[in-house]
Interface confidence: low
């Protein structure tokens, strides 16, 4: 069937439309287009004869129409009057006619709309605002947007005048937003520029900050006032009802008790004509004095004296606080507080009690700190230390010994050799020593303030021949795969080389062996039973050499998984069962047996005479090494046949 399709159906003014013919019959003589829904010679647009391929304009031809051989009609530069129906009249070769009608609609291109308002500065909770979308256009749809969102559902929002007018009743500050209107028809859509609604509101009840209402004498009072308002509020301050200034902030430096009172902030909005006030009560307290600490003993002696620290001044209805090393007081039987906490007593002071100490005065408003106080605790001298630690020297070298003992005040030192006073210095120096310089070297440290003295004696041997060394160990019974052992070659001698042998051989290369301390110390990490060998150390210098006696390392190990012998598991009735259990272990383990889980005897050998099938079962040997704390076991099944 012959049909006509309009492409597009809705056409914008100035554009073009194609009336496209479908199912055009064959064997045609020609065809003709008419404006309207029927064939009317007065409204013919154009005719076309196929044989001559000639198009003939009709009365309704406007010069904007083009006809195609397939009968389709293109109309260009469309005007509003072109809207409507178009009829195609087809004449076939057999002179039988056929008609089809199509249509399209013409719409104007919409202009960019704009928003008009009946109230540019509405007052919150009082005014209404009506926005109107201009211009008024026929066959157009009107839409509204708030902050680029479609209109929210609200009883205060009303659309009227074919949606062209948007009314906001009882505006609020939250209505301050971007408003746009949009016009639409089938061929175009245009959005207006934003209109920002400026809602006048406030002032709300002002807020005074900061919130605190208590101050100390001498502080600065700096109050700030803020009230939500559009336009911004104008502020005034009143103190005890008396006007002070028209500013948002009130600043009073170095306040006194006389500045206590009621402080009022008034906010005024000149556009809404509204005023709001907020009152805060400020209390100014007198400044308490700064505390300080007094002491009954500024130079106490360690382990002898007590010290009483007192927090001054004495003030009624005051809490006293104490800190040591910037921490609250530790719990200690040597620290005692008086009933009012004003006096802190340190019983039997130690050198660690130096402080610093601080006291504080606490009232209902604040805590004030004293300056820190440090105690000068007299102590020592402790046992002096003589360095270096060498005890053997070769003739001809210089002997330089230094003595040190912890002490306050610093100790005074004296040196004695074989009981004879030498000199009153911290260091003793003897050049080019000989065998005659061998002897007992005593350092005496004296504390003049406490009157205490302490001494340390060191034996010095001067000899060309080195002494026979010995080996000391930090662990005489190390446990396998657990402990480390450090051997040290004694004595420590100056300009001496230290050597080590294991089972008469030089040290093997092993990541578990480490030499340190100038090769004087040999450390075995994660000892094994294979480390249970003879260790010898040697010392040598340019004139002599000597070796220690061997030291055998006693490594505790095991027990390993035991072995039950003989290996037989099948026996004849009437035979004797004689099982022996053995496990590698140092020291030897304790043995015990269980048959079918029942404890038997604590022996290495289990003997049962003339066994019967009743002796069938599991025989377990348990081993335990009390020194390593380790246990092990093995189970064997025994079958006795009749």
């Amino acid at each position: 069937k012959l049909t006509i399709e309009s492409t597009p159906f809705n056409v914008a003014e100035g554009k073009e439309v194609l009336l496209l013919v479908h199912n055009l019959p064959q064997h045609l003589f020609g065809y003709s287009w008419y404006k309207g829904e029927r064939v009317d010679g007065n409204r013919q647009i154009i005719g076309y004869v196929i044989g001559t391929q000639q198009a003939t304009p009709g009365p309704a031809y406007s010069g904007r129409e083009i006809i195609y051989p397939n009968a389709s009609l293109l109309i260009q530069n469309i005007i509003q009057n072109d809207t409507g129906f178009y009829t195609l009249h087809v004449i076939k070769s057999d002179l039988v006619n056929e008609e089809a009608t199509g249509q399209f609609r013409v719409y104007p291109e919409l202009p960019k709309p704009s928003i008009s308002s009946n109230n540019s500065k509405p007052v919150e909770d009082k005014d209404a605002v009506a926005f109107t979308c201009e211009p008024e256009t026929q066959d157009a749809t009107y839409l509204w947007w708030v902050n680029n969102q479609s209109l929210p559902v609200s009883p205060r929002l009303q659309l009227s005048n074919g949606n062209r007018t948007l009314t906001l009743f009882n505006v609020t500050r939250n209505d301050t937003a971007s408003y746009k209107c949009e016009t639409q028809n089938p061929v175009s859509a245009r959005r207006s520029d934003s209109v920002i609604l400026n809602v006048l509101y406030g002032p709300d009840a002002p807020t005074i900050s900061p919130l605190n209402t208590s101050y100390r004498s001498g502080e600065n009072l700096n109050l700030s006032c803020h009230a939500a308002s559009n336009p911004p509020a104008q502020y005034s301050w009143f103190v005890n009802g008396t006007f002070q200034q028209s500013t948002q902030e009130l600043f009073i430096p170095n306040i006194t008790v006389n500045n206590s009172g009621s402080y009022t902030c008034q906010a005024h909005n000149s556009d809404t004509g509204l005023n709001r006030t907020t009152v805060t009560t400020i209390t100014v307290y007198a400044e308490p004095p700064k505390p300080f600490i007094t002491s009954n003993n500024s130079n106490p002696v360690e382990d002898e004296d007590a010290v009483a620290l007192t927090c001054e001044p004495e003030i009624q209805n005051t809490t006293y606080l104490w800190w040591v090393n910037n921490q609250s007081l530790p719990v200690s039987p040597r620290l005692q507080l008086s009933n009012d906490n004003r006096t802190l007593t340190l019983l039997s002071v130690t050198r660690n009690d130096v402080g610093p100490y601080e006291c504080g005065i606490q009232n209902e408003l604040s805590v004030d700190h004293s300056d820190p106080v440090i105690l000068n605790v007299l102590y020592g001298p402790d046992d002096p230390t003589i360095s270096p630690s060498y005890t053997y020297y070769r003739p001809g070298v210089n002997l330089s010994l230094s003595c040190h003992a912890a002490s306050n005040p610093p100790a005074q030192y004296s040196w004695l050799i074989d009981g004879n006073i030498q000199q009153h210095t911290q260091e003793l120096f003897i050049s080019n020593i000989t065998e005659k310089n061998s002897g007992l070297y005593t350092c005496q440290a004296n504390n003049s303030a406490s009157g205490h003295s302490r001494t340390t004696v060191k034996t010095i041997t001067v000899s060309a021949e080195l002494p026979k060394p010995s080996i000391s160990s930090n662990n005489s019974k190390p446990v396998e795969d657990k402990d480390a052992v450090a051997f040290t070659c004694e004595p420590e001698a100056q300009n001496t080389t230290y050597l080590w042998w294991v089972n008469g051989q030089s040290l093997p290369v092993s990541p578990r062996l480490q030499l340190s301390n100038g090769n004087r110390t040999l450390t075995l990490f994660n000892v094994t039973r294979n480390d249970a060998r003879a260790y010898v150390c040697g010392i040598q210098n340019s004139v002599s050499a000597n070796r220690s006696d061997p030291v055998t390392l006693d490594v505790l190990y095991g027990p390993d998984t035991p072995i039950i012998s003989p290996p037989d598991s099948s026996y004849l009735s009437g035979a004797n069962l004689n099982l022996s259990c053995h496990s590698a272990s140092n020291p030897s383990p304790q043995y015990s047996w269980r048959i079918n889980g029942i404890p038997q005897q604590h022996t290495q050998v289990l003997f049962i005479a003339k066994i019967t099938p009743n002796n069938n079962g599991t025989y377990a040997c348990f081993v335990s090494n009390l020194a390593t704390g380790r246990n092990n076991s093995i189970v064997k099944s025994i079958t006795v046949s009749a």
Partner: nanobody, 124 residues
């Protein structure tokens, strides 16, 4: 704008522990003494603990001394309240507050800025 934001509150059984945090912004944190206060339903807001700007000295109400520990991290602009051995009477809204220099405030007076609070409920 100065903001103090508390967190870490919740429900805990008696004897349990909680750690409250207060994150500060909009102020020079290292020059402020920080305090913790609490307000139980129907009661006045009361002092709990305070720590001076350097963190070297701390102060506690008698009711919490030995159980609560106040600390601060000036690098993170945060003050903490570690609460151990909690009791039902510790149930309250806990507030963080800031006081600029000056002596240490042991009441609500003297504190310039306050947080909104975090709820701590101690119940079996």
């Amino acid at each position: 704008e100065v903001q103090l934001v508390e967190s870490g509150g919740g429900v805990v059984q008696p004897g349990g522990s909680l750690r409250l945090s207060c994150a500060a912004s909009g102020l020079t944190f290292s020059t402020y003494t920080m305090g913790w206060f609490r307000q139980a339903p129907g009661k006045e807001r009361e002092f709990v603990a305070a720590i001076i700007w350097s963190g070297s000295n701390t102060y506690y109400a008698d009711s919490v001394r030995g159980r609560f520990t106040i600390s601060r991290d000036n690098a993170k602009n945060t003050v903490y309240l570690q609460m151990n051995s909690l009791r039902p009477e510790d149930t309250a809204l806990y507030y963080c507050a800031a006081q600029h220099f000056g002596p240490i405030g042991l009441t609500t007076r003297g504190y310039h800025y306050w947080g909104q609070g975090t709820l701590v409920t101690v119940s079996s």
